[in-house]
Interface confidence: medium
């Protein structure tokens, strides 16, 4: 017979021969890193017609890593299915909770042992710590000291002093979130006033107020014979300036020579897209506890 | 003009699959919460599942966690709700509705039969 | 069974004030967490009537109000009109969930 059969997980005992005789035996035994469960033979011998009788390295297994329970609070997932070395063990935490340790332990050959690669993590519950204060306003819990994941808080403005109101400018209502971090800024109480817009050869037609505060909205419109020169709707902004800028009402040429814009009598259309739903003084109702504060 | 305008409804058979989807016009999907609300036949409403702004948080309700997936395409500014293991209990009217603490835009809503 | 208690219906006739109420417990209202009013037309979608416990957004009329107190939530509508008659439906949070009340079915005499 020539050469035996070479395996995966099986090695042949001693040096191989080029040629070996019919009726020679030769052994073999399990890798570094496998070990053998019988019955199965791990032995073969050179057959009368040249050729070795079968065998397999069936009866040898991958050493394998000790089991490890799920960790509190969390689980612990076999990205391949078995123990065996070369597995790779994903821990991950219940909601709520954040892990302490690495999440992937890879089982490892040392010498002839399998052994994981670290510690298992821990999942420890998220907490933060109270919001911020701000200046002329409060929030609520502020005698918390400790916040668990997805607790709230909501911030609302102090009376003013004098005669205009503290505008909440931000998101009202913050939570705890995954990193332990605020799910935004804290929002800020401060007087936010517009000018009275004024349009000359105009009218304001929605918004009338002697007083503008944050996030009021107007409407114009211009008079008969002249057109609007910017956005027909302007905000009140927390920078207490009107956005888009107050707008113009122009003449409409009556030169032969000179087209005028074609227009009902408030003027063409702006392409300015106003935020939807406001009400003055008030955070807009289209923020709200996870929204993007940078829009 | 600024709306949401939903697809994907119709009738399933019990345990099956069904995606949801809510297309949003006027503003940037990946700028707010979005929510998926849904109302039994005669009842009142119940709220599904939201995601944050940037997606780093969904949560959902009892009632079909571990069935239902929100997501959200912002290249395609739309709202998904992914559906497995339908049971009749989930027959409703599905709404998406943009806002974090309240909702001050929802879609017209969409049918969803369970039914063998 | 809705974690936030509504009363299945109210009624009123035109132009009279009615109240609906909205009752909680210590881990929504009661928290100080903020409450919503949707009204729903019949075959329609919810529509935002108010925000943050007594916020009007703009186009809602002054009839309609909201205030809170302890655990509960009322909504007040006064001057009651044929086109109130709708499903109401208060709303507030708890950790990770959104809650709604059970609706409250206005009828116009």
């Known amino acids: 017979c020539e050469a035996p059969p070479t395996f995966e997980a099986m090695e042949l005992i001693g040096k191989p021969k080029p040629y070996y005789r019919v009726g020679e035996r030769v052994d073999y035994k399990c890798k570094k890193g496998y070990f053998y469960i019988p019955p199965l033979a791990t032995h073969t011998i050179c057959d009368r017609n040249h050729t070795w009788l079968p065998v397999s390295d069936e009866g040898c297994y991958r050493e394998m890593c000790p089991h490890i329970r799920d960790p509190l609070n969390g689980e612990a997932i076999l990205a391949n299915g078995s123990y065996e070395f070369g597995a790779e063990l994903h821990f991950i935490c219940n909601e709520g909770y954040y892990l302490i340790g690495k999440d992937i332990l890879y089982c490892e050959l040392k010498d002839t042992v399998a052994i994981w690669s670290g510690k298992p993590p821990l999942c420890e519950k998220i907490l933060c710590t109270p919001p911020p204060k701000i200046k002329n306003g409060k929030h609520t819990f502020s005698e918390v000291e400790v916040f668990e994941y997805l607790d709230a808080v909501t911030y609302s403005c102090d009376p003013a002093p004098g005669p205009d109101p503290f505008s909440l400018i931000g998101e009202s209502m913050i939570y705890c979130g995954n990193n332990s971090t605020w799910s935004h800024a804290a929002p800020e109480c401060k007087v936010v006033k517009c000018r009275f817009p004024v349009v000359e050869n105009g009218k304001q037609i929605s918004g009338f107020g002697k007083k503008f505060y944050y996030k009021a909205t107007v409407m114009f419109e211009c008079d008969k014979g002249y057109y609007l020169n910017g956005s027909d709707k302007i905000v009140c902004e927390s920078n207490s300036t009107w956005d888009p800028p107050v707008p113009k009402c122009l003449k409409v040429s009556t030169s032969p020579t000179t087209k005028s814009p074609t227009s009902s009598a408030s003027g063409p259309r702006p392409t300015y897209k106003p935020p939807v739903s406001n009400y003055p003084g008030y955070p807009k109702p289209d923020e709200g506890i996870l929204n993007n504060l940078d829009d | 003009q600024v709306q949401l305008v939903q697809s994907g409804g119709g009738v399933v058979q019990p345990g099956r699959s069904l995606r949801l989807a809510c297309a949003a016009s006027g503003f940037t999907v990946n700028n707010y919460a979005m929510h998926w609300v849904r109302q039994a036949p005669g009842k009142g409403l119940e709220w599904v599942a939201v995601i944050s702004y940037d997606g780093n948080n969904k949560y959902y309700a009892d009632s079909v966690k571990g069935r239902f997936t929100i997501s959200r395409d912002n290249s395609k500014n739309t709202l998904y709700l992914q559906m497995n293991s339908l049971r009749a209990e989930d027959t409703a009217v599905y709404y998406c509705?943009?806002?974090?603490?309240?909702?001050?835009?929802w879609g017209r809503g969409t049918l969803v039969t369970v039914s063998s | 069974q809705s974690v936030l208690t509504q009363p299945p219906s109210v009624s009123g006739a035109p132009g009279q004030r009615v109240t609906i109420s909205c009752t909680g417990s210590?881990?929504?209202?009661?928290?100080?967490?903020?409450v919503h009013w949707y009204q729903q037309l019949p075959g329609t979608a919810p529509k935002l009537l108010i925000y943050?416990?007594?916020n009007r957004p703009s186009g809602v009329p002054d009839r309609f109000s909201g205030s809170k107190s302890g655990t509960s939530a009322s909504l007040a509508i006064t001057g009651l009109q044929a086109e109130d008659e709708a499903d109401y439906y208060c709303?507030?949070?708890?950790?990770?969930?959104?809650?709604f009340g059970g609706g409250t079915k206005l009828t116009v005499l």
């Open positions: 509705a943009k806002g974090g603490g309240y909702f001050d835009l």
């Open positions: 943050g416990d007594n």
């Open positions: 210590s881990s929504n209202i009661g928290a100080g967490y903020d």
């Open positions: 709303s507030s949070y708890t950790s990770g969930t959104w809650l």
